[in-house]
Interface confidence: medium
């Protein structure tokens, strides 16, 4: 267990041209506050994914009113550190999001209004117990300077806060194989926490004497690989000898989530879904009310009359989630019909329609044939946002204006000669062949391969292609 600490040094205009306008004015005084969100690992996740390592809100800073005509200075900051307690091991690599929020204190009807001024994010490596790390991040024309560190809470020590320290039993030195606990030289490192023999690669522990297995491994010491075949119990395989998972105690047994949180298993551990008003790995941190500004992206917080009642965030269009933390991908609902391109402009949705379609959602199929005549007796056919002409015999082209040469495609088989005709084409067949396209051979005995020759035609006569 331990605490991640964040110290904001300054928030103000960054270097270079285009200094931002002050967020506060004489008409609209305001004050700043900050929110930090931590996630384990070098996560590329979106800003709205859960703050699995924890989150914290700062206090409000002093009220600030801009001096007319003066450039935006560094803005007055809240006192104190932002502290994010973590219950389990410090992961060593983490992702952070730091948001700077403005609370407007003008004559707002219904209380103060909040708006997000800047959001910075990054991924860092950090050992617990190390010195403060300094950082500078830019968001648009704003610059945020801050320091951070992770420190273990006694009795935990080490770069991941997983080693435990105990007061020395003897004044002079620690027991066999145990080192002094830097920086607490008067304490000794506690014996190994995990069960003896627990696989260092495939097992881990959070309590002394236990051995919990990573996904894919089983057995009392996590040394048996799991085979998923021939295992029928609800938790999967059921005996260490066959390499099957034992339906032993799961991480959610006994529900480690406090304050009515619901527990769900994860490959390594568990995750708590906390009721509103509680947060932290085990929902152990309480007391979030509307006064803490839990609604982001301009959401309106409506709170109950007493601490037992939940608050609710009413989100502006384009945002959702219990704290308005998620941007709505309204285009994912595919509102644009007929293959239109969806554009989410934030304040509104727009559909860019394909040719032949119109309307706010491309729902209107324009009459492709309106005002488009097909020449030479052709008929117009609508479809797919473009018109086409079905041409009368002997004509072709987009509008049936071109006279077609029916012989151009050499339609007469077996050396037959093609003649253009007012109603199409005629094939004069070579000796030994017959049919509209000279496709049928004539048998030597005079019978044809056709079931019967059309009346009035002898084999070898030209066949008119109708």
């Amino acid at each position: 267990a331990g605490v991640f600490e964040l110290q904001i040094h300054s928030f103000g205009p960054g270097p270079g041209p285009g200094a931002p306008r002050s967020p506060c004015s004489a008409r609209l005084p305001c004050r700043l506050f900050f929110r930090v969100c931590l996630k384990p690992g070098l996560s590329e996740e979106a800003a709205e994914s859960p703050c699995a390592l924890g989150a914290a809100l700062s206090a409000r800073g002093p009220v600030y009113t801009e001096q007319p005509g003066a450039p935006a200075p560094d803005l007055p900051l809240p006192d104190g550190l932002l502290q994010v307690p973590f219950r389990d091991a410090w992961p060593g690599t983490f992702s952070f999001i730091i948001e700077t929020w403005r609370e407007e204190l003008g004559d707002q009807i219904g209380g103060p209004a909040w708006s997000l001024l800047a959001r910075v994010a990054g991924r860092r490596r950090l050992a617990a117990g190390g010195p403060w790390a300094r950082d500078i991040q830019r968001a648009g024309a704003w610059e945020l300077r801050f320091s951070y560190r992770a420190r273990c809470e006694p009795p935990a020590v080490g770069t991941a806060c997983t080693r435990l320290c105990r007061p020395r039993s003897a004044p002079s030195r620690c027991g066999p194989g145990l080192r002094p606990c830097a920086p607490l030289e008067d304490e000794c490192e506690a014996p190994l926490v995990c069960r003896a023999g627990c696989s260092p690669e495939h097992g881990f522990c959070e309590q002394p004497g236990e051995c919990r297995c990573l996904e894919g491994w089983t057995g009392p010491l996590c040394t048996v690989p799991v085979s998923t075949s021939s295992c029928l119990s609800p938790r999967g395989p059921s005996s260490a000898t066959t390499g099957c998972l034992v339906p032993g105690p799961g991480p959610c047994d006994g529900n480690p989530c406090a304050n009515g949180g619901s527990c769900s298993e994860t490959p390594r551990s568990f995750e708590c879904t906390c009721p509103r008003g509680f947060y932290g790995l085990r929902c152990e941190v309480s007391g979030v009310t509307c006064a803490d500004g839990p609604c982001f992206n301009g959401g309106l917080c409506v709170g109950g009359a007493d601490p037992d009642s939940a608050y609710i965030c009413h989100c502006p269009p384009g945002f959702q989630g219990s704290n308005c933390e998620k941007r709505v991908d309204r285009c994912s609902l595919q509102p644009c019909r007929n293959g239109g391109l969806c554009l989410d402009l934030g304040h509104a949705l727009r559909c860019r329609c394909r040719a032949g379609f119109a309307g706010p959602r491309c729902e209107h199929d324009l009459d492709d044939c309106a005002g488009r005549a097909c020449a030479n007796g052709g008929t117009c056919v609508e479809g797919g946002g473009a018109h086409r002409c079905s041409c009368a015999l002997g004509f072709g082209g987009r509008d049936c204006r071109e006279r077609a040469d029916p012989c151009a495609a050499r339609p007469c088989a077996h050396g037959g000669r093609c003649y253009a005709h007012f109603s199409g084409l005629v094939c004069a067949c070579a000796p030994g062949y017959m049919g509209a396209r000279c496709e049928f051979p004539v048998h030597p005995d005079g019978a044809s391969a056709l079931p019967a020759a059309p009346p009035g035609l002898r084999p070898g006569d030209p066949q008119r292609y109708l």
Partner: antibody, heavy 118, light 107 residues
Framework: QVQLQQPGAELVKPGASVKLSCKAS????????MHWVKQRPGQGLEWIGM????????NYNEKFKSKATLTVDKSSSTAYMELSSLTSEDSAVYYC???????????WGQGTSVTVSS | DIQMTQTTSSLSASLGDRVTISCSAS??????LNWYQQKPDGTVKLLIY???SLHSGVPARFSGSGSGTDYSLTISNLEPEDIAIYYC?????????FGGGTKLEIK
């Protein structure tokens, strides 16, 4: 499509309790708040309270705190409202309504008519 | 609690008319206002949310406007199926409150 099914009517005796149900279908039940609204004959609508199925959070209109208890059964996607110590004042139509993601009651049940009579 | 007042409890109009129903709040509600339609059979439907956003499937003849404490619902071209009671509802503060309703009838 989103549907909220409520039984048509309940007849109960004064002093008794009644548990009204609202079965949801066509959407992810655990992701949306469920509201309950009262309408007395010939009168307007009155908000009773709301419950979040995943979190179990509730928020009541102070006026109904000692009258109504909201619960859910996630396995059957059903919201419940229990009304206790019934009097003739509780004779009304009770609606359940889903709170949409933009804070409007976007889908309503048909309502259950509760008659309190001896 | 925030009081929502619909001063006109009933109004009569002809088919094709433009009808406006008004609603006022006892304090500013920053556009956090919805409109609902209740048909004679008791069915309730959302029409407008956040003062002026049209709910999906609602005909475009319905529109909403307003700010601060005063809001209105307009039906631009009255049709027979619009016979109903119309309610406004604020969600700026708990408890959510509804107006008393405006009953719309055809002349």
């Amino acid at each position: 499509q989103v549907q909220l099914q409520q039984p048509g009517a309940e007849l109960v005796k004064p002093g008794a309790s009644v548990k009204l149900s609202c079965k949801a279908s066509g959407y992810s039940f655990t992701s949306y708040w469920m509201h309950w609204v009262k309408q007395r004959p010939g009168q307007g609508l009155e908000w009773i309270g709301m419950i979040h199925p995943t979190l179990g959070d509730t928020n009541y209109n102070e006026k109904f705190k000692s009258k109504a208890t909201l619960t859910v059964d996630k396995s059957s996607s059903t919201a419940y409202m229990e009304l206790s110590s019934l009097t003739s004042e509780d004779s009304a139509v009770y609606y359940c309504a889903r709170l949409g993601s933009l804070s409007m009651m976007d889908y309503w049940g048909q309502g259950t008519s509760v008659t309190v009579s001896s | 609690d925030i009081q929502m007042t619909q001063t006109t409890s009933s109004l009569s109009a002809s088919l094709g008319d433009r009808v406006t129903i008004s609603c006022s709040a006892s304090q500013g509600i920053s556009n956090y206002l919805n409109w609902y339609q209740q048909k004679p059979d008791g069915t309730v439907k959302l029409l407008i949310y956040y003062t002026s956003s049209l709910h999906s499937g609602v005909p475009a003849r319905f529109s909403g406007s307003g700010s601060g404490t005063d809001y209105s619902l307009t039906i631009s071209n009255l049709e027979p199926e619009d016979i109903a009671i119309y309610y406004c509802q604020q969600y700026s503060k708990f408890p959510y409150t509804f107006g008393g309703g405006t009953k719309l009838e055809i002349k």
